[in-house]
Interface confidence: medium
């Protein structure tokens, strides 16, 4: 019950996370333009992965896509592949796992299939949210160092005059949805690997053995055994193997830490 | 680079009217909004009035009525109407441009202009 119910919630998770993921990828709101010592404030600009926008104070937006990859920072490329990577692992991880699920039959699929299709959908989820998380921060850093060049730059001049104050940007909400997804999503996939371990049927050291003897009222107790191996009186090994007649579902064997009631 | 370029300042009597020009130049492609600012003798520099790319305009209290701001989105090229000058209005006149000189990612820029001197006095 406890392993299908942590296998339901990762899946809800991931879920939930890689939605935001697509979110954060789709949304133009990556950075946006400070508005301290801004001169202009009849216009509010702000970028996305794919386009940038202006929004004048009426209201009115225009937005223009990024249709040459000249005059692009080359650390965008690295985040829009680790963006879709991430979405891409996600949407696999997200098939599997629904084959994975405890709580859905498919076939005669034995446990141990599921086990391991829910170990790889939580390995993709654990990588998908790496790459949203490590995709964000590094537009973030790259946000944070152009800040400060900006800032740098906007006190400079000829003669004193500033002829040129270059646009400082922030953090956009497109950043924060984006960690919050990918966290959700690597945690999804954690939930998911520990699920993998409770749905994984391990092998005992030790095979129960039942013996049959040929009588009905014969007890089969090794004395020589007992005698030259000091177990004494079998206080630890309180199994006697009593013969005669019994179904399988009799058999007494020793209870195993992974037998759920 | 982009360049900013003021004209049409000069000596006004009170009550006159003046017409200022900024015309921009270089690689631009595409200007979002300007404005007008003006720095008295002694003084901060004050925003005047801003226009947007599709023809929103806002003033400061002080020129509202008197002051009329416009573009030409085919000249680059922004325009002030100056009605029922005063004295008070005496000023270095810079023009503000809020461009984004190329496609790309934070390349947007507010660029200003060199300034023209309107006196005005009796």
């Known amino acids: 019950m406890a392993v299908t119910a942590c296998q339901g919630l990762g899946f809800v998770v991931s879920l939930i996370g890689i939605a935001g993921i697509i979110a954060a990828t789709c949304m133009d709101q990556w950075s946006t333009q400070d508005l301290y010592n801004n001169p202009v404030t009849a216009v509010f600009n702000y970028q996305g992965l794919w386009r940038s926008c202006v929004r004048e104070s009426s209201g009115f937006t225009e937005c223009r896509g990024y249709f040459t990859l000249l005059g692009l920072p080359a650390m965008l490329q690295a985040v829009r592949a680790l963006m879709i990577v991430g979405i891409v692992l996600g949407a696999i991880g997200l098939l599997v796992s629904i084959f994975a699920l405890k709580c859905i039959r498919i076939g005669s699929m034995e446990d141990s299939a599921k086990a391991n299709m829910t170990l790889t959908s939580g390995i993709m989820f654990i990588v998908s949210g790496l790459c949203a998380i490590a995709g964000v921060s590094v537009f973030a850093n790259m946000l944070v160092t152009n800040f400060w060049m900006s800032t740098a730059n906007m006190y400079t001049g000829m003669g004193g005059m500033v002829q040129t104050v270059q646009t400082r940007y922030t953090f956009g909400a497109a950043l924060f949805v984006g960690w919050v997804a990918g966290g959700l999503t690597l945690i999804g996939g954690v939930m998911m690997c520990i699920a993998c371990r409770g749905l994984a049927p391990e092998e005992t050291n030790y095979k129960a053995v039942s013996y049959h003897a040929s009588g009905h009222s014969v007890a089969y107790k090794p004395g020589g055994f007992k005698a030259s191996t000091g177990f004494g009186s079998n206080t630890k090994n309180k199994k006697i193997y009593d013969g005669g007649a019994r179904t399988e579902d009799e058999v007494q064997s020793y209870p195993s830490k992974h037998d759920y009631v | 680079e982009v360049q900013l370029v003021e004209s049409g300042g000069g000596l006004v009597q009170p009550g006159g009217s003046l017409r200022l020009s900024c015309a921009a130049s270089?690689?631009?492609?595409?200007?979002?909004?300007m404005a007008w600012y003006r720095q008295a003798p002694g003084k901060g520099r004050e925003w005047v009035s801003e226009?947007?790319?599709?023809?929103?305009?806002d003033y400061a209290d002080s020129v509202k009525g008197r002051f009329t701001i416009s573009r030409d989105n085919s000249k680059n090229t922004l325009y002030l109407q100056m009605n029922s000058l005063r004295a008070e209005d005496t000023a270095v006149y810079y023009c503000?441009?809020?461009?984004?000189?190329?496609?790309?990612?934070?390349?947007?820029?507010?660029?200003w202009g060199q300034g023209t001197l309107v006196t005005v006095s009796s």
């Open positions: 503000a441009a809020f461009i984004i000189p190329s496609v790309g990612m934070f390349t947007s820029r507010t660029y």
């Open positions: 270089g690689s631009i492609y595409r200007i979002n909004a």
């Open positions: 226009i947007t790319s599709t023809g929103n305009t």
